[in-house]
């Protein structure tokens, strides 16, 4: 048994059919010694008296929030939550495994450039009793700063017949250089309580391996004369590292129809422009990639090709 | 501790095009590495990331884009001294911070070529002959250091008497491989913006 | 499986005029770019236009214009290549070549030899 | 026009060698660079597309890199079917253009 926050106790089980459990001894907090006695929950049943009550935890029934009483006045809470263990495994229920870019992906982090700034975001398709709590470190020998807000709910989707939730948080590396070469990972650690069910969830990374950038900002087209080629240009977003001569994007440029079967003009370029063909009821795309160390390209950034 | 603004004029920056192909030769070497040794351990996550040039050169600090150099967690107080001649300065404006990145680059170069080339060695001596370094990496590195044209003693090649680890040595490959990757990526986004300078 | 069938050799004299075509089948024909390259015997290979089937828009290089006209039939599945005023130096394997992509060729007709001799 | 040169014209190799072709563009064309495959009497085939992107059904021996001008594509255990000429293409502008070719012969 460990303290997750003040009067918040999580019980480690192994759970497997017959299991015996864990002994647990609550202490009542306060300075009087006699006519002491426990409830658990909403429950008036008395489970015990004094100022210790010694409990067998085997499931969910024996956890949740015990209260030491005396004369009709409460003295303390002690609030208990299993996180289970099965087969040697620490449960996953809680959040949904997104399978990307690996199994067993639970937590997800991007960055939009390197000043130490990520956000992290899960998913999960429990939509009430559910807290999350967020705490990262870079390094976890000799740990360094890093400042996470509250995890918020970002996002409800319809998949299927169930609804799913995601959550996400921001963090920020409390002295980042952007030009530093990572030799320790950050590591994101994520408490996730549902009901009197606890879990913990990690991930690890550098930033340079979660880069995406934002898609490129401002695109514009310029039809070249006695030609059916354009000229597109675009710039580099703005929430892109600076120096851009540092900090240097590549880019794809695509001229795509509607449907993805359909035919495409494509080329990479590492200039803020490019000559492309386009085609009626076509648009043209372009992305962006870090150009020296690739990590993930941005999202499309599109005009249409009339 | 950080590069001016006058700088090379551009085209006139012959090392942006090897610091190019240096990126390239490292990346290709390493996914080489990843591929052939997928029972090492030898991801980005699975090996320890160590930096042989720590504590001996400065080269982060000592390129740091001007712009970056307002922001205090960029500047750390190590302080080297070097060489200061390099035909990589093709301007009478080239300041002495310049000097200073780019001979902390040829010593990272220079450090990195002398493992590399001990590492060769031993892997030569594997029955299995399961990876040698890239003679292309090697001439790449070369070519780099060449135009960069410092003049630095020569740091003799190290010599192991005691049989070699294969196993140890491969995994060594592997770390050095992954922190030089990142190294020259630094290299690149240094060259990359000397030449826009 | 996606193919391009080309007709067959054609000899011609100096100055004359020659069609060769290429039959599409296994794929959508306005789905695909079509592109024509040449080479000359024993020479490397040379761009010369191309035709998006689905509107007949064309580019060709420089080198060319005004010496070769592609067209294509969707009712066939057929492209076609036109020179005009050939000369020996004309004389070439033509390839047509196709691929939902502009730039690079990712299916090949088995080419056609146009040679050009009075 | 941006010109493409090759190099070597010709190389002679024996069945495993491992075979490094070149491609150097005359201006920057950044990955927009393919390279095919011909034989005596055959038509082209694709075997690389934007510099180092595979081609499904192309054996994993071939491989390319590059960025820039400058370009490789490699044969790590060169086998009996790849004897042949080789060609990089760009696509970073029109007119699309060629390398001249380098030809892949039995030692």
């Known amino acids: 048994i460990w303290e997750l926050k003040k009067d918040v106790y999580v019980v480690e089980l192994d759970w497997y059919p017959d299991a015996p459990g864990e002994m647990v001894v609550l202490t009542c907090d306060t300075p009087e010694e006699d006519g002491i006695t426990w409830t658990l929950d909403q429950s008036s049943e008395v489970l015990g008296s004094g100022k210790t009550l010694t409990i067998q935890v085997k499931e969910f029934g024996d956890a949740g929030q015990y209260t030491c009483h005396k004369g009709g006045e409460v003295l303390s809470h002690s609030l208990l939550l299993l996180h289970k263990k099965e087969d040697g495994i620490w449960s996953t229920d809680i959040l949904k495994d997104q399978k990307e870019p690996k199994n067993k992906t639970f937590l997800r982090c991007e960055a939009k450039n390197y000043s130490g700034r990520f956000t992290c975001w899960w998913l999960t398709t429990i939509s009430t009793d559910l807290t999350f709590s967020v705490k990262s470190s870079r390094g976890s020998s000799d740990p360094q700063g890093v400042t996470c807000g509250a995890a918020t709910l970002s996002a409800e989707r319809v998949r299927g017949d169930n609804k799913e939730y995601e959550y996400s948080v921001e963090c920020q590396e409390d002295s980042a250089c952007p030009a530093a070469e990572e030799s320790l990972p950050i590591e994101v650690m994520v408490d996730a309580v549902h009901k009197l069910k606890y879990e913990n969830y990690t991930s690890s990374f550098f930033i340079r391996d979660i880069i995406k950038p934002d898609p490129p900002k401002n695109l514009q087209l310029k039809p070249l004369k006695n030609s059916r080629q354009v000229e597109v240009s675009w710039e580099y977003p703005d929430t892109w590292s600076t120096p851009h001569s540092y900090f240097s994007l590549t880019f794809c440029v695509q001229v795509q129809g509607k449907s993805k079967r359909e035919k495409k003009d494509r080329v990479f370029t590492d200039k803020t422009s490019a000559t492309v063909i386009c085609r009626k009821n076509a648009s043209i795309s372009v992305r962006a990639q870090d150009r020296y160390y690739s990590s993930s390209w941005s999202e499309w950034a599109s005009v249409p090709c009339s | 501790r950080n590069l001016p603004v006058a700088t090379p004029d551009p085209g006139m920056f012959p090392c942006l095009h090897h610091s190019q192909n240096l990126l390239r030769a490292v990346s290709n070497m390493l996914q080489k590495a990843r591929q052939t040794l997928e029972f090492y351990p030898c991801t980005s996550e699975e090996i320890d990331h160590e930096d042989i040039t720590k504590d001996k050169t400065s080269t982060v600090e000592a390129c740091l884009p001007l712009e970056l150099t307002k922001n205090e967690s960029c500047l750390n107080s190590r302080e080297t001294s070097f060489i200061t001649n390099g035909s990589c300065l093709a301007s009478r404006k080239t300041s002495f911070m310049m000097a200073l990145c780019l001979s902390s680059i040829y010593e990272d170069l220079k450090m990195y070529q002398v493992e590399f080339k001990t590492m060769n060695a031993k892997l030569l001596m594997d029955p299995k002959r399961q990876i040698f370094l890239d003679q292309n990496m090697l001439a790449v590195i070369d070519e780099l250091m060449q135009a960069l044209n410092f003049n630095s003693e020569t740091v003799p090649q190290k010599s192991s008497l005691e049989e070699p680890d294969f196993y140890k040595t491969k995994i060594k490959l592997c770390i050095l491989l992954h922190a030089f990757r990142i190294r020259a990526v630094t290299i690149d986004r240094v060259m990359s913006y000397l030449n826009a300078s | 499986e996606v193919q391009l069938v080309q007709s067959g050799a054609e000899v011609k004299k100096p100055g004359a005029t020659v069609k060769i075509s290429c039959k599409a089948s296994?794929?959508?024909?306005?789905?695909?770019?079509l592109h024509w390259v040449r080479q000359a015997p024993g020479k490397g290979l040379e761009w010369m236009g191309w035709i998006d089937p689905e509107n007949g828009d064309t580019e060709y290089a420089p080198k060319f214009q005004g010496k070769v006209t592609i067209t294509a039939d969707t009712s066939t599945d057929t492209g076609y290549l036109e020179l005009s005023s050939l000369r020996s130096e004309d004389t070439a394997v033509y390839y047509c070549?196709?691929?939902?992509?502009?730039?690079?060729?990712?299916?090949w007709g088995q080419g056609t030899l146009v040679t050009v001799s009075s | 026009d941006i010109q493409m040169t090759q190099s070597p014209s010709s190389v002679s190799a024996s069945v495993g060698d491992r075979v490094t072709i070149t491609c150097r563009a005359s201006?920057?064309?950044?990955?927009?660079l393919h390279w095919y495959q011909q034989k005596p009497g055959k038509a082209p085939k694709l075997l690389i597309k934007?510099?180092?992107q595979s081609i499904s059904g192309v054996p994993s021996r071939f491989s390319g890199s590059g960025s820039g001008t400058d370009f490789s594509l490699t044969i790590n255990s060169l086998q009996p079917e790849d004897f042949a000429t080789y060609y990089c293409?760009?696509?970073?502008?029109?007119?699309?253009?060629f390398g001249g070719g380098t030809k892949v012969e039995i030692k």
């Open positions: 296994g794929y959508t024909f306005s789905d695909y770019y």
């Open positions: 201006q920057s064309i950044s990955i927009n």
């Open positions: 293409q760009q696509s970073n502008s029109f007119p699309l253009t």
């Open positions: 070549a196709a691929n939902k992509e502009l730039r690079y060729f990712d299916v």
């Open positions: 934007f510099a180092s």
